[in-house]
Amino acid sequence: CDLPQTHSLGSRRTLMLLAQMRRISLFSCLKDRHDFGFPQEEFGNQFQKAETIPVLHEMIQQIFNLFSTKDSSAAWDETLLDKFYTELYQQLNDLEACVIQGVGVTETPLMKEDSILAVRKYFQRITLYLKEKKYSPCAWEVVRAEIMRSFSLSTNLQESLRSKE
């Protein structure tokens, strides 16, 4: 399955939108920095495309879920958020098309499930952090910065998979 070139452009647009969403000076939020334990090993270059597509899909689905909440809507600019949803939705469609094509049917399902579970637990930690911080503006900024970093790392994986072809 070949992800369309527009998928890469969409990833870049997503990062740009995340950057634009910033609402307050970040220097005041340093005290709220937190280790969310991004499962970087689940996005290592050792993965084959077949194993990676479902993990990337899970990552983007979880980002969509995180920013689709009532609390998120209250924290961010509505126009930017709508554009953000649109970009994520398009990327999910691209990845789903690959999953439907049967990529990874012959792969060890357990490895994929473990990776998907690691991504879910990562987002559970993020959600718990926001709850503990009472969805404060700084907590959301820390989460936005974390999502930019993790999304960027997963995007780099997509690019490395493309270049291997």
Epitope: A19, R22, S25, L26, F27, C29, L30, K31, D32, R33, H34, D35, F36, E141, V142, A145, E146, M148, R149, S152
Partner: antibody, heavy 121, light 106 residues
């Protein structure tokens, strides 16, 4: 390879203006903040201020607020430190260093080689 | 501003010695970094977040502590370790450094 390359040594007279630079390469320049640190001859490290190159937001140490200006041009991955009117007491080595912002990662993990500024009449 | 107080300001030690440098913050912090600086060179990050060893730094360096009291330990001093060491709080701006500890050859 991540690198921060600073502009060369400067010799200036009191009252003159100066702008020194720090060019980042080998990483996404807008994903990290750039901090500036002063070291006067034979003395310790003093944090001056920091900039987020993605939108040029800045924070200064109270000791340096109003004395210097920190800026950045993300199109050329370069941060700047400038003075409008130098004093003899500005004679020092100035370092830039990158900072991960709000991410949980090492602070000031890469440093420039330093720019020596000498102010003398 | 958060004040950082390092001790001692200097110490003399021999190769193979265990060396301990302390850093005290004027208020509770969760982010403390340690740097090494040699004459004419830029500082080099050794330890971040109080106890995490920076990539490429020898394992003889370690950091510990929390709240207001932090420690940098060199388990067995090597010839290349003679330098000045600085602590720095990254908890809040303005970031602040300790005054430095110079490690000299006995």
């Amino acid at each position: 390879e991540v690198q921060l390359v600073q502009s060369g040594a400067e010799v200036k007279k009191p009252g003159e203006s100066l702008k020194i630079s720090c060019k980042g390469s080998g990483y996404s320049f807008t994903s990290y903040w750039i901090g500036w640190v002063r070291q006067m001859p034979g003395k310790g490290l003093e944090w001056m201020g920091i900039i987020d190159p993605s939108d040029s937001d800045t924070a200064y140490s109270p000791s340096f607020q109003g004395q210097v200006t920190i800026s950045a041009d993300k199109s050329i991955s370069t941060a700047y430190l400038q003075w409008s009117s130098l004093k003899a007491s500005d004679t020092a080595m100035y370092y830039c260093a990158r900072h991960p912002g709000l991410n949980w990662a090492p602070d000031f993990d890469y440093w420039g080689q330093g720019t020596l500024v000498t102010v003398s009449s | 501003d958060i004040q950082m107080t390092q001790s001692p300001s200097s110490l003399s030690a021999s190769v193979g010695d265990r060396v301990t440098i302390t850093c005290r913050a004027s208020q509770s912090i969760n982010n403390l970094n340690w740097y090494q600086q040699k004459p004419g060179k830029a500082p080099k990050l050794l330890i971040y977040w109080a106890s995490s060893l920076q990539s490429g730094v020898p394992s003889r360096f370690s950091g510990s502590g929390s709240g207001t009291d932090f420690t940098l330990t060199i388990s067995s001093l090597q010839p290349e370790d003679f330098a000045t060491y600085y602590c720095q709080q990254g908890y809040d701006t303005p970031f602040t450094f300790g005054q430095g500890t110079k490690v000299e050859i006995k």
